[in-house]
Interface confidence: low
């Protein structure tokens, strides 16, 4: 048993919709008689090894859980003692205990149940940024950008919506772009503008609301 060791964090926390990289090193005895390749899998605690599929595996012949397919990835190569796990589009129901299993046909089959990974997926607490370049001048077009710099590139791209109940310059109430181009009018001053960002991979939406400050150039008439 001493030769079977796994070094990984005991606990990892990630916010829903985001990604996390779990570094992991795995050690197993080097038996010369075992000629088969080393394959590794991450499994959720409590599953039957014979009935349930893993959440991620390096074995191309093995199926993985539908719920984690495409989201959980065994990044590391177990043959190189690397069992690193990458999770994208984290979902609340991913929360749980996970363990690593190594297989080397025909003799080696070992589950590292003494070194389990506790994964906690918490509510998304971050909000988008709304970036306004300079001042909003009545009658002049402006580009507003809704930004989520904390989102991970490997995740499902988020969708953007812009909402306002009183923005007279918007031809429609929503647009699916992270950049909103509009020409503010004097009557838009003080209205609220909301950017909604939906992470469809996790089914979660966050938003940021600002109050528009529309200025008039000197010489413009007040209504």
């Amino acid at each position: 048993d001493l030769e079977f060791q796994l070094v990984a964090p005991e606990s990892v926390t990630v916010e829903e919709g985001l990604c996390v990289h779990v570094p992991c090193s795995v050690f197993y005895p080097s038996i010369k008689l075992t000629l088969g390749p080393v394959t590794g899998s991450w499994l959720r605690k409590g599953v039957s090894l014979h009935e349930d599929s893993p959440v991620a595996t390096s074995d191309p012949r093995q199926l993985v859980q539908k719920a984690t397919q495409g989201r959980f990835q065994l990044l590391g190569d177990p043959q190189k003692h690397d069992c690193s796990l990458f999770i994208r589009d984290a979902q609340k129901n991913d929360t749980g205990m996970y363990f690593f299993r190594v297989v080397r046909e025909p003799f080696v089959r070992y589950s590292y149940k003494k070194s389990q990974l506790s994964l906690h997926v918490t509510s998304l607490s971050r909000t988008p940024d709304i970036i306004i370049p300079g001042t909003l001048e009545a009658g002049y077009p402006s580009n507003l950008t809704c930004s989520v710099p904390w989102a991970c590139e490997q995740g499902t791209p988020p969708t953007f919506s812009w909402m306002s109940t009183a923005l007279t310059s918007l031809s429609s109430r929503t647009t699916d772009s992270s950049v909103l181009t509009f020409t503010p009018q004097p009557q838009d001053h003080g209205t609220k503008l909301t950017c909604l960002v939906t992470f469809s991979g996790a089914g979660v939406t966050v938003e940021r609301t600002i109050q528009l400050n529309v200025t008039r150039k000197s010489g413009q008439m007040r209504e």
């Epitope: 919506s161 909402m163 306002s164 109940t165 109430r173 609220k192 909301t194 909604l196 939906t198 992470f199 469809s200 996790a202 089914g203 979660v204 939406t205 938003e207 609301t209």
Partner: nanobody, 120 residues
């Protein structure tokens, strides 16, 4: 001024079903929406909530029996209640969150409540 109109409450036998509706007038845009309930002599508690993207959350005691849904185009919120029990008897309120703040405090809109009585 935003006004919420709730409907669908009433008297139902244990094991029966009801569908509550909450319609918002006044043109507000709703980001998150939720149903709360308050039983006689008890504090108001969250029953279920739903985000604009459709992500839902349920109190443990109603999970599997109640379903929250919304129609963004109609600014309407619904609560389908199945397998009702006597302990579900309460005044049910809808709460809409337009994602706005007033003096740095979140602004919520509450309905006037609709009574649900589960009794044989």
């Amino acid at each position: 001024q935003v006004q919420l109109v709730e409907s669908g409450g009433g008297l139902v036998q244990p094991g029966g079903s009801l569908r509550l509706s909450c319609a918002a007038s006044g043109g507000t845009f709703v980001i998150n929406a939720a149903w709360y309930r308050q039983a006689p002599g008890k504090q108001r508690e969250l029953v279920a909530s739903i985000s604009y993207g459709g992500s839902t959350n349920y109190a443990d005691r109603v999970a599997g029996r109640f379903t929250i849904s919304r129609d963004n185009a109609k600014n309407s919120l619904y609560l389908q209640m199945n397998s009702l029990r006597a302990e579900d008897t309460a005044v049910y309120y809808c709460r809409l969150d337009p994602g706005l703040a007033l003096n740095n405090r979140p602004l919520y809109y509450w309905g006037q409540g609709t009574m649900v009585t589960v009794s044989s």
